[in-house]
């Protein structure tokens, strides 16, 4: 039952003009000599949003992005000329597009850019304290960016910097063919995925990387990569894309003979996000676009939100699927994919799996294997030839929590906020699109907490011209959303309660967990507030039960739209 398939109409539809006039958006419209404001790093402590763009890195004040500092980091004329002579576009390609921007330590960030098809990295000093107001490039210390940033600005890097080590999924060559997951920096030898083996990675596009603990023992920590890639022949008829989750042990140092300086614990599994079709054939949303991890009380089990689109040119659709880490782990503990039989088909591997099971992190938890270099040859050879799992990971409830079809846009980004409301906690999704709009959606349980209904609260246009939203960050501290695109950066509050109208019924019908009727206006709901007059009903949106102030009036039929 897809309530979400009906392309439900937003409670509020706000144009860019309306957003501006109601002071609900602040925009930084970019610099004349820059673009591609795609790489975000949120620093709640310093109250800064760092943004990597073309030839620039910005430090925006989270309170108001109109207040910013900038670092100019272009390439030399020589580099730019070399790039041009290699047949690249001088404006779109022969510049330093920032692709990696991570916190390195208490005082520095680590940044990498394409360097006009010659990747380069450096450190940025930001100081110890917010009041230090330091933001400067360490131009005395540049590092080779190969395996950290792609050469081509059209490609993304999924990166994660932990304990002084940079994990990155990117293309490591000029041609953009040698895609790999790397670990660089730190004191150890760089490690990467096996080269020229399509079983490991098959022309992937990396989305994001996350550290997720496996147990209470930090030795078991894993880094998970989300990406999409071409399905290997035999997995699918015709050319198809598969969404993937890949895992690597943080303490993987490669093999002792085979897989030397290569991951020995890399495994990947397919992420399914599909709906049953009328003809019995599922419609798959395979083009993974973005991932957001919603942390729970248990750091081992965040909820994974994924934004997907269809591969089809005929049928344009987007979906949001949720995954549980326990389901992911179950798949990684399941059968490995193995090619066998007369047609060389993928089948579940039925033979003896070596010990310790490939993909297990070496630790005291599992039999005293202190390092991946200590693994016996059979574990390494098996790992090398069986990087994929046979079973896919299905979403929670085996279906998307939201789908959008036959609309003129597709989803590109997602962030999620967990909001305390009068009747429980709700996850509010902010979904960016390829036309510069943001959808604000709340998941509301129907009969059970498993059966979710999507309520589309708002559809906001946040850029003057239609543009693909390529980055989003949410500040719970500031209660603001920050949005990046080629054109610039936008900032908007997470809630606009006053826009829902001047009556209790309208406030209640909005079903926005951020908002409640306080007796005189629709305003921000705080669960700690003692006011008994707070009226809110996210689950049912029923004003009759919750509004006894006669505020139902004849306005109930036109609360839906602002044009």
């Amino acid at each position: 039952n897809y309530a979400n398939g009906k392309n439900n109409v937003p409670r509020l539809k706000l144009s860019y003009k309306e957003m501006l006039e109601s002071n609900n958006v602040i925009t930084f419209n970019g610099l004349a000599n820059s673009s591609s404001y795609h790489t975000f790093l949120l620093d709640e402590e310093r109250s800064r949003l760092y943004v990597g763009a073309k030839d620039h890195i910005f430090s925006f004040n989270l309170v108001n992005i109109k207040d910013f500092q900038k670092i100019v980091w272009p390439v030399s004329y020589t580099r730019r000329d070399e790039c041009k002579w290699a047949g690249k576009d001088i404006l779109k390609e022969c510049a330093n597009f920032i692709k990696v921007l991570k916190a390195y330590n208490q005082t520095h960030l680590y940044a990498c850019g394409t360097g006009a098809f010659h990747p380069i990295c450096t450190y940025i000093e930001v100081g110890h304290h917010p009041e230090d107001n330091i933001f400067k490039l360490q131009d005395s210390h540049f590092e080779n960016g190969r395996g950290k940033s792609p050469y081509d600005p059209k490609l993304l890097t999924a990166s994660l910097l932990i304990d002084g080590e940079l994990y990155s999924g990117t293309a490591a060559d000029f041609m953009g063919r040698d895609f790999a997951i790397f670990r660089t920096l730190g004191h150890h030898h760089p490690i990467r995925t096996e080269q020229h083996d399509s079983r490991w990675l098959n022309d992937p596009r990396f989305i994001s990387a996350h550290l997720i603990p496996e147990s209470d023992n930090p030795e078991d920590d894993k880094v998970y990569f989300f990406f999409r890639e071409n399905a290997i022949d035999g997995e699918h008829s015709g050319k198809a894309t598969h969404a993937r989750i890949g895992q690597i042990c943080k303490n993987d140092f490669g093999g002792h003979r085979s897989l030397v300086n290569k991951w020995t614990t890399f495994l990947k599994a397919r992420l399914i996000c599909s709906v049953p079709g009328p003809n019995g054939i599922d419609t798959h949303f395979d083009e993974l676009q973005d991932v957001f991890l919603m942390n729970s009380k248990d750091p081992k089990n965040p909820i994974v939100y994924g934004v997907f689109t269809t591969s089809s040119n005929i049928f344009k659709g987007s979906a949001v699927c949720m995954y549980s880490m326990s389901d992911v782990r179950r798949v990684f503990l399941g059968p490995y994919a193995h090619r066998d039989g007369p047609n060389y088909q993928w089948v579940p591997y039925q033979g003896r799996v070596p010990y310790p099971r490939p993909g297990t992190c070496p630790s005291k938890t599992f039999g005293g294997f202190d390092s991946t270099k200590d693994l016996p040859d059979d574990v390494i050879t098996f790992a090398r030839s069986h990087p994929a799992m046979y079973n896919p990971v299905f979403p929670i409830n085996n279906r998307p929590i939201m789908i959008k079809t036959d609309v003129n846009y597709q989803f590109t980004q997602i962030v999620v906020d967990r909001v305390d409301a009068e009747d429980g906690q709700y996850d509010v999704m902010f979904i960016g699109t390829d036309v510069g709009t943001v959808l604000k959606v709340v998941s509301v349980p129907k009969e059970t907490w498993h059966d979710l209904e999507e309520v589309l609260l708002e559809e906001m246009t946040v850029f003057r011209e239609p543009t693909t939203i390529s980055a989003m960050e949410l500040s719970t501290k500031q209660q603001q959303l920050y949005i990046g695109s080629t054109a610039g950066v936008a900032q908007l509050p997470l809630h606009r309660c006053d826009i829902y109208g001047k009556a209790c019924a309208e406030c209640c019908l909005a079903r926005d967990p951020y908002c409640a009727w306080d007796g005189s206006s629709c305003s921000r709901y705080f669960p700690t507030a003692k006011a008994r007059t707070r009226a809110q009903d996210i689950r049912n949106g029923d004003p009759l039960t919750h509004c006894s102030d006669g505020g139902i009036e004849g306005r109930m039929d036109h609360h839906h739209h602002h044009h």
Epitope: R257, R352, P354, G367, G368, F369, D374, L375, P376, T381
Partner: antibody
Framework: EVQLVESGGGLVQLGGSLRLSCAAS????????MSWVRQAPGKGLEWVST????????YYPDSVKDRFTISRDNSKNTLYLQMNSLRAEDTAVYYC??????????WGQGTTVTVSS | EIVLTQSPATLSLSPGERATLSCRAS??????LHWYQQKPGQAPRLLIY???QSISGIPARFSGSGSGTDFTLTISSLEPEDFAVYYC?????????FGGGTKLEIK
């Protein structure tokens, strides 16, 4: 120079037990897998057991599983093989071997175990 | 388990001749094959590891080749001290297994 010296072999009754020891020197003992390989009179070589560097896990063929236990004391540079429920077919020369993660590069001179009925 | 078949069981040659010993695996084992030499009353010693890697201290006349299922140990020109029993061993997967051996004897 790598040296492996086995001891503890001898004559034992059917169903009896025996503990073999191997004193290692000339290399960093704790940095290597260690193994036991045996050779029945006039026969070929048979792998008996391999233990990982830390001693936390060991591998056995079905022929000795649940009867033999390999162990090591890295502080004493010593490898052990505890053999229980001995059978006539366990009669062999038992070699202590350095390696087992890959190839077995150094072998002791062996100790003879004879199981009599 | 992986079965290793060595052939011939006995090879009779004269000093100075070339010896070719074969080892066949029941399934593909990549290059995870090692060769050992054993003389009467002595412990085996490692000659070649991972199919073709030579060991320091082992004469250059010993060489190994092959991968997958078929492997060869070659002694280019036999010396009197080379007459012994030769074993192959797979390290591809547990349980480790040895071939039955090839006895190289003086003709």
């Amino acid at each position: 120079e790598v040296q492996l010296v086995e001891s503890g072999g001898g004559l034992v009754q059917l169903g009896g037990s025996l503990r073999l020891s191997c004193a290692a020197s000339g290399f960093t003992f704790s940095s290597y897998y260690m193994s036991w390989v045996r050779q029945a009179p006039g026969k070929g070589l048979e792998w008996v057991s391999t233990i990982i560097k830390s001693g936390g896990y060991a591998y056995y063929p079905d022929s000795v599983k649940d009867r033999f236990t390999i162990s090591r004391d890295n502080s004493k540079n010593t490898l052990y093989l505890q053999m229980n429920s001995l059978r006539a077919e366990d009669t062999a020369v038992y070699y202590c071997v350095k390696g087992g993660q890959g190839a077995m590069d150094y072998w002791g001179q062996g100790t003879t175990v004879t199981v009599s009925s | 388990e992986i079965v290793l078949t060595q052939s011939p069981a006995t090879l009779s040659l004269s000093p100075g001749e070339r010896a070719t010993l074969s080892c066949r695996a029941s399934q593909s084992i990549g290059d995870y094959l090692h060769w050992y030499q054993q003389k009467p009353g002595q412990a085996p010693r490692l000659l070649i590891y991972y199919a073709s890697q030579s060991i320091s201290g082992i004469p250059a006349r010993f060489s190994g080749s092959g991968s997958g299922t078929d492997f060869t140990l070659t002694i280019s020109s036999l010396e009197p001290e080379d007459f012994a029993v030769y074993y192959c061993q797979q390290g591809y997967s547990f349980p480790y297994t040895f071939g039955g051996g090839t006895k190289l004897e003086i003709k």
